[in-house]
């Protein structure tokens, strides 16, 4: 079981950043840490996607991962895909600092993210509270502004 | 259950330097982002800034800055605040708090009084 | 910066009266929205993130609304141990700001 792993967030625009995760144990919570760059101030979604696949840029990546086909939702609640890690701010020089515990998303098992895209989004995830269909798939968070595939570290 | 406990009350002269800690346990101290917020006496809450201790990365709100340094030790799991050139309006309760962002501030130390009399 | 203001600065109420504290908020926020409480002697206590989701462990009759710029924390019937102070913060931008809080006395 890989305990490390690792994700280059690179997108079109100027916005890249470097993503570590650490699970110390196989049913454990992962550590997910590191620092973003060039996005504009606020909050941004930051989800884990489907497939590794970046042939065409960071749409390739297809919808959050949903193994267990639930409805969109934020890092805290019950209902939310695997793959939903919630926002991340950037300051007024663009820059996101993450540091996020979560005990959904494994480096191993079924909801093993190795091999997978993770990715930082225009706009803010409503967590599914924005009373649209969109919110419910999305969070509203927007266009795909940068993305990597993440891959077991050493 | 993650707790914080913070240091004891402090008496400082004006001009003096002033070093509070705030130390976690039972949870993950590394993970988290740890905030400092202070209230003098008759007023509200205010945000001095905030560290990441993982990262060892922090901000700063604009009117502390220069006077104010967070670090934290995540060997002892332990973040400390030092606020320099202290004059008597920062007599004041000094909180850290575990900051999870746009989830809020949900645990926080007990307090610590800092009194800055001549 | 963003400025929280919040109305009224303190309010008097008997147990088992709905109270309602606004805040508003300089600029949009969309739901990015705190609300706590605080007593006198005590650390804050988280209430109310995302403007609306309650925190666990709190009782069902504190709620919150809004979005944008306008925000509501209600308390359904107020309980004697409601009596403190209570503070919005955004979570929208650093750096986090709060609002100059409202007491919620007996009358």
């Known amino acids: 079981m890989a305990t490390k792993a690792v994700c280059v967030l690179k997108g079109d625009g100027p916005v890249q950043g470097i993503i570590n995760f650490e699970q110390k144990e196989s049913n454990g919570p992962v550590k997910v840490w590191g620092s973003i760059k060039g996005l504009t101030e606020g909050l941004h979604g930051f989800h884990v996607h489907e497939f590794g696949d970046n042939t065409a840029g960071c749409t390739s990546a297809g919808p959050h991962f949903n193994p267990l086909s639930r409805k969109h939702g934020g890092p805290k609640d019950e209902e939310r895909h695997v793959g939903d890690l919630g926002n991340v701010t950037a300051d007024k020089d663009g820059v996101a600092d993450v540091s996020i515990e979560d005990s959904v998303i494994s480096l191993s098992g079924d909801h093993c993210i190795i091999g997978r895209t993770l990715v930082v989004h225009e706009k803010a995830d409503d967590l599914g509270k924005g009373g649209n269909e969109e919110s419910t798939k999305t969070g509203n968070a927007g266009s795909r502004l940068a993305c990597g595939v993440i891959g077991i570290a050493q | 259950q993650v707790q914080v406990v913070q240091s004891g009350a402090e008496v400082k002269k004006p001009g003096s330097s002033v070093k509070v800690s705030c130390k976690a346990s039972?949870?993950?101290?590394?993970?988290?982002?740890i905030s400092w917020v202070r209230q003098a006496p008759g007023q509200g809450l205010e945000w001095m800034g905030r560290i990441i201790p993982i990262l060892g990365t922090a901000k700063y709100a604009q009117k502390f800055q220069g006077r104010v340094t967070i670090i934290a030790d995540k060997s002892t799991s332990t973040a400390y605040m030092e606020l320099s050139s202290l004059r008597s309006e920062d007599t004041a309760v000094y909180y850290c708090?575990?900051?999870?962002?746009?989830?809020?501030?949900?645990?926080w130390g007990q307090g610590t009084t800092v009194t800055v009399s001549s | 910066d963003i400025q929280m203001t919040q109305s009224p600065s303190s309010v008097s109420a008997s147990v088992g009266d709905r109270v309602t504290i606004t805040c508003r908020a300089s600029?949009?926020?969309?739901?990015?929205l705190a609300w706590y409480q605080h007593k006198p002697g005590k650390a804050p206590k988280l209430l109310i993130y995302a403007a609306s989701s309650l925190q666990s462990g709190v009782p069902s009759r504190f709620s919150g609304s809004g979005s944008g710029t306008d925000f509501t924390l209600t308390i359904s019937s107020l309980q004697p141990e409601d009596f403190a102070t209570y503070y919005c913060?955004?979570?929208?931008?650093?750096?986090?700001?709060f609002g100059q809080g409202t007491k919620v006395e007996i009358k």
């Open positions: 600029q949009g926020i969309s739901s990015w």
């Open positions: 708090a575990r900051d999870q962002d746009y989830y809020g501030m949900d645990v």
């Open positions: 039972g949870g993950t101290f590394s993970s988290y982002a």
């Open positions: 913060q955004q979570t929208n931008n650093f750096p986090w700001t």
